[in-house]
Amino acid sequence: SITGISPITESLASLSTYNDQSITFALEDESYEIYVEDLKKDKKKDKVLLSYYESQHPSSESGDGVDGKMLMVTLSPTKDFWLQANNKEHSVELHKCEKPLPDQAFFVLHNRSFNCVSFECKTDPGVFIGVKDNHLALIKVDYSENLGSENILFKLSE
């Protein structure tokens, strides 16, 4: 369960891939599209509001006999819109929604090498936001093999 309904902290940051491509958001036909692209030098990076929540895992669920906490995040590039996992389509979409946000809008935060982070779907453990064909997609990751795979690594810049 997510502890409380308020985030423990929030920050505005731009989101880029391991290979320094920018994640951008564009309003098209009354809906937002998400792009992964090389930005021209003078173009300002889009900022995302990251809201961080603590999720309490009782020892009965954690499997190691210890109560644990996870850091979960929601990502909002513009007012009232949040990134959401569409597990059926293996896609990442921007949806307008009201609070309380659906579980599909929450991602477990993982720290990685090279000062990168990864975002794991709360609703589908082992599935991460990743880059596929210059778009964001949901990518299934084999824990034993691929946690360092570059296509699920992202950089946050305040």
Epitope: T9, S11, D64, L109
Partner: antibody, heavy 121, light 107 residues
Framework: QVQLQESGPGLVKPSETLSLTCTVS????????VHWIRQPPGKGLEWIGV???????SYNSALMSRVTISEDISKSQVSLKLSSVTAADTAVYYC???????????????WGQGTLVTVSS | DIQMTQSPSSLSASVGDRVTITCLAS??????LAWYQQKPGKSPKLLIY???RLADGVPSRFSGSGSGTDFTLTISSLQPEDFATYYC?????????FGQGTKVEIK
């Protein structure tokens, strides 16, 4: 109950390799990152590196050419090796566990008691 | 690397005093800052994480504030067991650097 215990030789000769083991219990290395930190006598804390949940490793660039961190999940152990040691590597060495599953953003919630390693001939 | 500068490096205070320690980061670290207490011969103990969150079992007289580059640890009413050295640490980027420490001594 969460526990971390450092072990290894208390005395290492200059130019040799310092080897320490952190044995953990009460939590899973597949969920939590384990860090190595050192503290020279009477001085402050220096972060050495981390073995993250999932097995990726990050090192302090100031030590990267000399340091290796590895794990043996079956024994619930994380190892530290520091090569070509000098007197400047004399310190209390600690291992510590992340506060959060999968993330270091919440700091280090549990620490071992530390082990003093002296580098001297 | 991100440099963390703590001030003061030491202070003398009496039981019941309000004590404030500051930590300055060389670049923004959002709110990814932790405070630790260390007593002689002991391991550091996590007091505050995410700049403002009280760790489990830590008395409410300890509080943290700040974001970006400027952070503060406050002890509202110093108790005899609070005489120790306090360290800040940034967790925004590796290497996860510590401040040089603030020793709180009995006046």
């Amino acid at each position: 109950q969460v526990q971390l215990q450092e072990s290894g030789p208390g005395l290492v000769k200059p130019s040799e390799t310092l080897s320490l083991t952190c044995t953990v219990s009460g939590f899973s290395l597949s969920k939590y990152g384990v860090h190595w930190i050192r503290q020279p006598p009477g001085k402050g804390l220096e972060w050495i590196g981390v073995l993250r949940a999932g097995g990726t490793i990050s090192y302090n660039s100031a030590l990267m050419s000399r340091v290796t961190i590895s794990e043996d999940i079956s024994k619930s152990q994380v190892s530290l090796k520091l090569s070509s040691v000098t007197a400047a590597d004399t310190a209390v060495y600690y291992c510590a566990r992340d506060h959060y599953y999968y993330s270091s953003f919440g700091g280090f919630a549990s620490w071992g008691q530390g082990t003093l390693v002296t580098v001297s001939s | 690397d991100i440099q963390m500068t703590q001030s003061p490096s030491s202070l003398s205070a009496s039981v019941g005093d309000r004590v404030t320690i500051t930590c300055l980061a060389s670049q923004t670290i959002a709110t990814w800052l932790a405070w630790y207490q260390q007593k002689p011969g002991k391991s550091p103990k996590l007091l505050i994480y995410a700049a403002t969150r009280l760790a489990d079992g830590v008395p409410s007289r300890f509080s943290g504030s700040g974001s970006g580059t400027d952070f503060t640890l406050t002890i509202s009413s110093l108790q005899p067991e609070d005489f120790a050295t306090y360290y800040c640490q940034q967790l925004y980027n590796t290497p996860y650097t510590f401040g040089q420490g603030t020793k709180v001594e009995i006046k």
